[in-house]
């Protein structure tokens, strides 16, 4: 199936020109997106172009601006937040990049009403993170890991914690490994519908092992980071949650919500909170062991000024095969009764589905069904559930968006996007207005990328909100590669791949291939989105074919080829890029002899594993930011897939699947091996260990380190690493430069 | 030319009620959340309750339960019905779109509401 049909008119071909490597770090075919920032059911803000914070009225069409872009320069403001009165905003300026999620930032507050900044009690800097309640002005942060209110922005704030230290005790934001592996959010704290209450986290990293890395800076001496980080078997984060009343903060303090007693019994993990009213939250825990998890349902006591968790309210999911959910256990969305909820979870026959539960889990009611995944449900009301799925025409690697009539019997299911802009959009997300009146529909490809409004009732677009003509101009002289998504059918396994084809592409002839994975548990590769990236411009100019395969452990076809790794990584990921590399032989097109793989981050792993396969089919491969040994990584993430590194667990495998102990098949190809020197994630430990164990075995091979960069290498690390690996893969397969 | 015109303030005692009326002209406010807003003496203006087009309020808390904000859409008119009085009501009230428009200078001349104890 060709996605991308690259234009080839000899009329044409003079003035066509192929992709640069300077296009592809100047970042010259970016694409927008357009994401609504909901304010009601018909209202929604957008910062503009020239950057004054604009409200758009879908149903009069109108438009007016509410905060002027010399407000938001007048405090060097990058983001805002408008309170749900509409009173206020706060202004975010200073922005410092912490982790993944995290950042500190300084914060003004601005009074719409008498368009003024509020003076008086303002905010202390740098806040760790601000929020507004759902409903009103009030105001919760987090500074120096302690969590404060304030009942409206000028007044003097009320602190709820005061145990926070940095490294040692968080309130309301997360640790390093809660952050990353966990909740995949800067916050641990969350207001009740109506802002009554707000539940916060508190985690106590107290005896929790400490990476301790340098970052070398300008000055004489290098100051050295230190991260409480759990590494496989390790101590874990003690965690507990609180709900404080926030009209009456002082009455009774922070109250601390009961852990299920099947899941106090040993070690656990805190995986999400949701609130369903204002007096009813529901608490997802999860065994350090991660195949069970406990959905517990609380209520207030009104007598007692307590919460109550009923075991008659503690629904168990459990997997006999693999680990719970998918890479995270999946949150409920609840209905109008207030009780009942749908979740995804997998079916009898171990594929990922939508369920309705009313009273048990055991009585579930199954709303979706196939071999396929439901993949996110994004709004329930009263008559519809939408949700994404890659069911449409099988093609796993797509994202459609489907609507459930839930208010008929039989309920009725209509695909919204299947067949809006069929050749150009087959990856939707979606995001939906109050009471879902409106949404927006938000393609990632494969075609360029367009973002519309609908109407929540009869589905009708109403406007486009982005569609990229600038970027469709641009690409109109440059030849792109060509994409096809397709599969492989090898030994009972479906191997969906990727490939990127040069230009003037002829079967008859002989390229060189790039072999791009991750192969992360629960990853995907295979997507039909699209993107002008540095494998594009390899394909373009360079002349590579390029192919992306989705190997056993990854996503969204079943629990067989997801689970197919638990206990075993680093086996069967590597052997199903191995097999797809056969394959790929046998259809003439690729020339043996210059074969490469690459990866990044798990990636990385993989691509230094194939290289060391002893199988003579890569010439070369390049990992970037690799982990090397299980025990090197974080425990949340590792123990998931790996279980403990015990003796009477699953040592064996934790020592048999590190890139060290197969230092001596790097023998016979070039690699390439690159890390930051300041990576947070994947420590810089591990290439460190690689590089020891190919020098203790006489091994030969290239490195560069990054220094003071993380797991992301940005900035001119970018750039610099891009070229590198240009000229590496062109020496490797002898093209000219 | 746009226009804001807040009318049926007045005094009243401690309990008492009001009904307050805003007539707006000008395409800007058909169809879009509107607001009342008071200003007490030496004070900040503030919001008092806000309504969305398709009829869904907000009121703070020290009105919640008094006061009650509504709507005419043929006539262009929003209304506050202010009961239980008290005291600290006393402001010149405003109406206005919800949030105001920057740079809208027009804010109406309001309508003074007194409570007497």
């Known amino acids: 199936i060709v996605l991308r049909p690259s234009r080839v008119h000899n009329s044409e071909e003079n003035t066509m020109r192929a992709l640069t490597l300077k296009d592809i770090l100047n970042g010259t075919f970016s694409y927008k997106t357009f994401f609504p920032n909901w304010i009601s059911g018909q209202e929604y803000l957008h910062q503009s172009a020239d950057n004054n914070i604009v409200l758009y009225n879908i149903e009069t069409g109108q438009s007016y601006t509410i905060l002027s872009n010399r407000t938001m320069k007048s405090v060097n403001a990058s983001n805002y937040g408008l309170s749900p009165d509409r009173q206020f905003v706060y202004l975010e300026s200073d922005y410092s990049k912490l982790w993944r999620y995290s950042y500190t930032a300084t914060y003004y507050i601005y009074d719409l009403s008498n368009g003024e900044f509020v003076r008086g009690n303002e905010l202390p800097r740098p806040i760790q993170y601000l929020c507004w309640s759902p409903v009103g002005s009030k105001l919760a942060y987090v500074y120096q890991n302690n969590i404060y209110l304030k009942q409206r922005p000028g007044d003097p704030p009320f602190q709820i914690t005061f145990n926070g230290r940095e490294n040692k005790i968080f309130n309301g934001i997360p640790d390093w490994v809660y952050e990353e592996e966990m909740l995949a959010t800067k916050y641990a704290l969350w207001w009740s519908p109506n802002g009554k209450f707000l539940a916060y986290a508190e985690f106590n990293d107290t005896d929790i092992p400490v990476i301790a890395y340098s970052y070398y800076g300008d000055e004489q001496y290098p100051r050295t980071i230190n991260i409480p980080y759990p590494k496989a078997g390790a101590k874990n984060p003690v965690v507990r949650i609180f709900i404080i009343d926030t009209t009456y903060p002082a009455y009774v303090g922070p109250q601390e919500v009961p852990v299920p007693a099947m899941i106090a019994s040993s070690d656990y993990y805190f995986s999400w909170l949701t609130w369903v009213t204002d007096e009813r939250v529901c608490l997802q825990w999860l065994k350090r062991v991660q195949n069970v998890s406990v959905l517990s349902i609380c209520d207030f006591r009104e007598d007692w000024q307590t919460w109550d968790c009923p075991k008659t309210q503690e629904h168990i999911e459990e997997s006999r095969t693999g680990w719970a959910g998918g890479f995270f256990v999946s949150t409920p969305v609840f209905s109008y009764d207030a009780i009942s909820y749908y979740k995804i979870f997998s079916d009898k026959d171990g594929y990922k589905h939508i369920h309705y539960i009313k009273d048990t889990v055991e009585n579930a009611i199954q709303i979706t069904s196939g071999k396929w995944e439901a993949i996110n449900i994004f709004r329930v009301t009263q008559d519809s559930l939408f949700y994404s799925s890659n069911e449409f025409e099988e093609y796993p690697g797509r994202r459609n968006i489907y609507r459930i009539s839930i208010g008929s019997y039989p309920p009725s299911k209509k695909c919204v996007t299947c067949h809006l802009r069929k050749e150009r959009c087959q990856y939707y997300t979606a995001s939906f207005s109050d009471y879902a009146k409106y949404y927006a529909l938000v393609c990632y490809g494969p075609g360029i990328p367009i973002s519309t409004l609908h109407d929540g009732r009869t589905d009708q677009e109403i406007k486009i909100l982005e569609e990229n003509k600038e970027l469709e101009n641009a690409l109109k002289n440059i030849q792109l590669p060509k994409e096809e998504i397709k599969k492989l059918e090898v030994d009972e396994i479906t191997l969906w791949y990727k490939m990127i084809l040069p230009p003037q592409f002829d079967r008859s002839k002989k390229y060189p291939l790039l072999i791009q994975v991750y192969g992360g548990p629960c990853s995907q590769s295979v997507r039909s989105v699209f993107a002008v990236n540095w494998i594009s411009y390899l394909a373009s100019k360079e002349g590579m074919v390029i192919a992306l395969v989705d190997g056993r452990g990854t996503a969204f076809q079943g629990d067989k080829l997801l689970y197919a790794v638990y206990r075993k990584l680093g086996v069967y990921e590597v052997e199903d890029q191995i097999t797809a590399v056969r394959k790929f032989i046998e259809m003439g097109f690729i020339d043996e002899k210059r074969i490469a793989i690459w990866g990044w981050s798990y990636g990385g792993y993989v691509s230094s594993l194939a290289l060391a396969s002893g199988t003579g089919l890569f010439k070369c491969g390049i990992a970037v930011a690799p982990v090397s040994s299980w025990e090197y990584y974080a425990s949340v993430y590792t123990e998931r897939f790996m279980g403990l590194p015990t003796k009477d667990d699953n040592l064996e495998h934790y020592k048999n699947s590190t890139v060290m102990a197969r230092a001596e098949y790097f023998r016979n190809v070039d690699y390439l091996l690159i890390h930051g020197t300041a990576d947070d994630n994947v420590h810089f430990q591990n290439s460190a260990q690689i590089a020891k164990a190919l020098v203790n075995a006489q091994v030969d091979f290239q490195a560069m380190w990054y220094s003071d960069q993380n797991h992301g290498l940005s900035g001119l690390s970018t750039n610099h690493l891009y070229t590198h690996m240009t000229h590496f893969l062109k020496q490797c397969f002898s093209l000219s430069d | 030319q746009v226009q804001l015109q807040e009318s049926g303030g007045g005094l009243v005692q401690t309990g008492g009620s009001l009904r307050l009326s805003c007539a707006a002209s000008?395409?800007?406010?058909?169809?879009?959340?509107m607001g009342w807003y008071r200003q007490a003496l030496g004070n900040q203006r503030e919001l008092v309750a806000g309504?969305?087009?398709?009829?869904?309020?907000y009121y703070p808390d020290s009105v919640k339960g008094r006061f009650t904000i509504s709507r005419d859409n043929d006539k262009n008119t929003i209304y506050l019905q202010m009961n239980s009085l008290k005291p600290e009501d006393t402001a010149v009230y405003y109406c206005?779109?919800?949030?105001?428009?920057?740079?809208?200078?027009?804010w109406g001349q309001g309508t003074q509401v007194t409570v007497s104890s």
């Open positions: 309504i969305t087009s398709d009829g869904i309020t």
């Open positions: 206005n779109l919800w949030p105001p428009r920057i740079g809208f200078a027009s």
């Open positions: 000008g395409s800007i406010f058909v169809g879009n959340a």
